[in-house]
């Protein structure tokens, strides 16, 4: 993913105290790999700012150089700034690392807008607020970039957590997570809880606030309520899944389900918005407009450009519908649905109106590269990337923003036939034509 409509990192509200959490609805203990229960050292290890990405602290080299790294499930390279740049406070200095090894190979990654290029090498990497291990990993040292780093975002690199198939320059470059699992006893699973603020943050609050958790090697039960529902990873490149039905306030969009996955549907922590294929986006917006017709909003708002402002604390959440995506289940002809609130798809934006107003951007947008379940979706849920079992789990996040009337939900099972037909089969083309940009 790269931030074009990149993800909001709206730092997070902590979840309720454990005593207030909903009980597990079912016991899936035996089905989940990895360490059980508490990963207290990894909780709250993500930070960030609205629309600019969630990042984790990492160290690279010997002696360790500390960098903030964007967590991106929509790409597969570990790449860090390695030369001075106006937007970087610090960067990886290979010459200061006694453990750096040059691979004598370059890498060039173009996006729809912008690019980065660099030199490949390996070095020792660890995650201070992660597992207590150090691994030798491939690193792309970014020497030149355009519209990649973001002014004030506070991150200096990107951690691509997807599969080798989409790594650059080719799939022979082992991604960080593969290296981590190979070189340690850490189970092949990680999970993300991205916590949106739900209200505009001023500069100070945004810098200070917690963004969420990346749990490496398992699942932390304190981060979600209810049960986890799993959808198969269709193919190990992006984290590709299959959407079988879409509803707005319970009203089926009634489209051929192939449209929902044209040309793919992915879970991408490095994208801000819920991005939908053109036809689906148009139908969804029409339906959302109809549901919220007591008020009319400008065309530019639905394009994600204009911001709508309300008196602080008076945002009429109730006039906006919920959005439900039905995902293929693990059992034949069974699906489950994830439901997000306007508190997820209206993204708070700071510094535009007076302090007496709350202003929001519409964070559902059009895509030419398939559905992208970005932060707008992920901020509602605890998302488990169970690579070992080739599945992705969703449960209601303990930190999601909601009101007294509605909450995000993960519900099932639902009977859905012929779900395999919902997947789109991309015609095989030369790998160099793959779209890298997710703007």
């Amino acid at each position: 993913t790269h931030l074009g409509i990149r993800l909001p990192l709206r730092s997070g509200l902590a979840g309720p105290p454990l005593g207030l959490r909903l009980p597990r609805e079912t016991d899936e203990e035996s089905e989940e790999p990895g360490r059980r229960g508490s990963f207290v050292e990894m909780v709250d290890n993500l930070r960030g700012k609205s629309g600019q990405g969630y990042y984790v602290e990492m160290t690279v080299g010997s002696p360790p150089q500390t960098l903030n790294i964007l967590v991106d499930t929509g790409s597969s390279n570990f790449a860090v700034g390695a030369a001075p740049h106006p937007f970087l406070h610090r960067y990886y200095q290979r010459q200061l690392s006694s453990t750096y090894r040059d691979l004598r190979k370059g890498v060039y990654v173009p996006y729809t807008q912008g690019k980065w290029e660099g030199e490949l090498g390996t070095d020792l990497v660890s995650i201070p607020h992660g597992p207590n291990v150090t691994v030798r990993a491939n690193i792309a040292a970014i020497t030149e970039s355009d519209k990649f780093f973001i002014n004030g975002s506070n991150w200096e690199g990107i951690l691509g957590l997807a599969y080798a198939e989409i790594a650059r320059p080719d799939d022979s470059l082992e991604p960080f997570f593969d290296s981590l699992v190979k070189q340690t006893h850490i189970p092949n699973i990680f999970s993300l809880q991205l916590c949106g603020a739900g209200f505009p943050l001023n500069q100070t609050e945004a810098l200070a606030s917690v963004g969420g958790s990346m749990i490496i090697g398992g699942i932390d039960h304190s981060l979600y309520t209810g049960r986890l529902w799993y959808t198969p990873i269709r193919r190990e490149w992006y984290y590709e899944v299959i959407i079988v039905r879409v509803e707005i306030n319970g009203q089926d969009l009634k489209m051929d389900c192939k449209e929902y996955n044209y040309d793919k549907s992915i879970v991408d922590s490095g994208t801000t918005n819920l991005r939908l294929p053109k036809k689906v986006f148009e139908a969804a917006v029409k339906s959302i407009k109809a549901a919220s017709s007591t008020e009319k909003f400008p065309d530019g708002f639905w394009l994600g450009e204009q911001l709508v402002c309300w008196q602080a604390g008076t945002t009429p959440w109730n006039i906006f519908p919920v959005i439900s995506l039905y995902l293929m289940g693990e059992v034949t002809n069974q699906s489950f649905r994830i439901t997000i609130l306007p508190q997820q798809y209206l993204r708070p934006v700071e510094d535009v109106a007076t302090s007496q107003d709350d202003c929001y951007k519409f964070a559902v947008s059009q895509s030419s590269t398939g559905t992208v379940m970005g932060a707008v979706i992920m901020e509602g849920f605890y998302v488990v990337f169970d690579r070992a079992r080739k599945r992705i789990g969703f449960a209601v996040s303990a930190c999601h923003v909601h009101d007294e009337f509605r909450t995000a939900a993960v519900e099932g099972p639902f009977v859905t036939a012929d779900m395999e037909d919902c997947g789109y089969n991309i015609p095989q083309t030369d790998e160099s034509t793959l779209m890298t940009g997710r703007a």
Epitope: E295, K296, E305
Partner: antibody
Framework: QLQLQESGPGLVKPSETLSLTCTVS??????????WGWIRQPPGKGLEWIGS???????YYNPSLRSRVTISVDTSKNQFSLKLSSVTAADTAVYYC????????????WGRGTLVTVSS | EIVLTQSPATLSLSPGERATLSCRAS??????LAWYQQKPGQAPRLLIY???NRATGIPARFSGSGSGTDFTLTISSLEPEDFAVYYC??????????FGGGTKVEIK
């Protein structure tokens, strides 16, 4: 051709409530394509947005005036109204009613304006 | 809050001359900017919307340009009726609310 016409008293006493009505002729206030609003201009000064209203009665107000302003709509009379309470001399201005068009983002049609003086 | 600053405050020109008016936003407003003309004793009228689109009935000598934070209203050749006050207004934040302080174009 659609026209807007403000009406109401030209003189209001301090601490009282200013009340103005805008009558829409040549078109319907119930159109889904527009909001309707009020803008004022103190003598010799710039333009200040007061607030806007949709046919459903949904309103938006200038934060600096919010505690004193009420805008309402009467679709049966094709009118919308402004009430501004607890007025002072600083509220003396020409008050314009406007249509908010062009993607409900710009003030594309204006009434002629009415001068309201706040004085005892 | 987005603040619009217009310059110059007053522009003294002769008929037939070219007028260039500036409006600067304190942060990007994309292309969501309009220009209005107000003659003495009259209500303002919309000239340009979305930075560069002429409103209905506006002569071609009026043109708008710019995006982001810097915008320009150009009157290619001033006619006697063009001497007036010009205001810019942004609508990136909605409902539309923010006007610039105005530029007076007067006869030299």
């Amino acid at each position: 051709q659609l026209q807007l016409q403000e009406s109401g008293p030209g003189l209001v006493k301090p601490s009282e409530t200013l009340s103005l009505t805008c009558t829409v002729s040549g078109g319907s206030i119930s159109s889904s394509s527009y909001y309707w609003g009020w803008i004022r201009q103190p003598p010799g000064k710039g333009l200040e947005w007061i607030g806007s209203i949709y046919r459903s009665g949904s309103t938006y107000y200038n934060p600096s005036l919010r505690s004193r302003v009420t805008i309402s709509v009467d679709t049966s009379k094709n009118q919308f109204s402004l009430k501004l309470s607890s007025v002072t001399a600083a509220d003396t201005a020409v008050y314009y009613c406007v249509r908010v068009g062009h993607g409900i983002s710009y003030f594309d049609l204006w009434g002629r304006g009415t001068l309201v003086t706040v004085s005892s | 809050e987005i603040v619009l600053t217009q310059s110059p405050a007053t522009l003294s020109l002769s008929p037939g001359e070219r007028a260039t008016l500036s409006c600067r936003a304190s942060q990007s407003v994309s292309s969501y900017l309009a220009w209005y003309q107000q003659k003495p004793g009259q209500a303002p009228r919309l000239l340009i919307y979305d930075a560069s689109n002429r409103a209905t009935g506006i002569p071609a000598r009026f043109s708008g340009s710019g995006s982001g934070t810097d915008f320009t209203l150009t009157i290619s050749s001033l006619e006697p009726e063009d001497f007036a006050v010009y205001y810019c207004q942004q609508s990136l934040t909605w409902p539309p609310r923010t006007f610039g302080g105005g530029t007076k174009v007067e006869i030299k």
